[in-house]
Amino acid sequence: HGTELPSPPSVWFEAEFFHHILHWTPIPNQSESTCYEVALLRYGIESWNSISNCSQTLSYDLTAVTLDLYHSNGYRARVRAVDGSRHSNWTVTNTRFSVDEVTLTVGSVNLEIHNGFILGKIQLPRPKMAPANDTYESIFSHFREYEIAIRKVPGNFTFTHKKVKHENFSLLTSGEVGEFCVQVKPSVASRSNKGMWSKEECISLTRQYFTVTN
């Protein structure tokens, strides 16, 4: 009876700051009663911990059991299919899940207008699950950078790009009026982490925002 079921074809993590989700793909021809067992291994403690005996979804939030990710050597996870007394072999994540695997995001971007400039303020992520001392800026304490993409509406595909090294930035509009839409993608210069583009924030600039000087 041991291992008649096929194993989940793929298992991987998708993670943002204190939001660590394990994903896997279903076994072929799974039945109504097929579920998935999830186990976790912390590097340095070489034993597998069972996290869920029978998940019927194809993802599992492991944030609560990986809260020390940012102060550890990382984790591996494994998943197997279970159907009654039958189970598959384990499929293990093929990379170590560490701080390097976390996709960087911003919390939000606030825009305002002052004297023909667009002033932007980047709010850093503040996830509820994060321990009080583990702020984004304490974990990524140096070399935070942000790529800024600006789109003027209309003119859907005309992008201007700039890179800034602070959470506050200013964009010169060259006296143009209209709607300006901004997206931000964070990075850390000393790290290889991927960044995710933020939701687009837009602001309208009209003549009233320009100061007339003689």
């Epitope: 991987w12 998708e14 793909t25 979804t57 992008f159 790009h161 993608k185 995710m196 939701k199």
Partner: nanobody, 124 residues
Framework: QVQLLESGGGLVQAGGSLKLSCTNS????????MGWFRQPPGKEREFVSS????????YYSDSVKGRFALSRDKAKNTVYLQMDSLKPEDTAVYYC?????????????????WGQGTQVTVSS
């Protein structure tokens, strides 16, 4: 900075095939994956298929499993939805979207940067 453009829709007879493409024309793709959703006339938008960008792992709704196949070309920043054995009930506007958070591959809430959509009509 993800700008998605769908193509390949059209009118086809039941039993026929179509191949939809979705290309990111933005400078860089930063999502976890891509998904196709559809909106049949007078109905809600529903999940069709999705793919993880790195591993190429795919998911399908029960209604298209075995008939549709999703693939990706990383070099071209493009995903392809091969639709075979089409049925009249596959008639819909098909939308492509980027997966922008770590949540489920089946939920519209996990996706953003939606394309404009491409019409697929299957006649009987």
């Amino acid at each position: 900075q993800v700008q998605l453009l769908e193509s390949g829709g059209g009118l086809v007879q039941a039993g026929g095939s179509l191949k939809l493409s979705c290309t990111n024309s933005g400078r860089t793709f930063s999502g976890y994956g891509m998904g196709w959703f559809r909106q049949p006339p007078g109905k809600e938008r529903e999940f069709v298929s999705s793919i993880n960008w790195i591993y190429g792992a795919t998911y399908y709704s029960d209604s298209v499993k075995g008939r549709f196949a999703l693939s990706r070309d990383k070099a071209k920043n493009t995903v392809y939805l091969q639709m075979d054995s089409l049925k009249p009930e596959d008639t819909a506007v098909y939308y492509c979207a980027a997966k922008i958070n770590g949540e489920s591959y089946f939920n519209t809430g996990s996706f953003g940067s939606w394309g404009q959509g491409t019409q697929v009509t299957v006649s009987s």
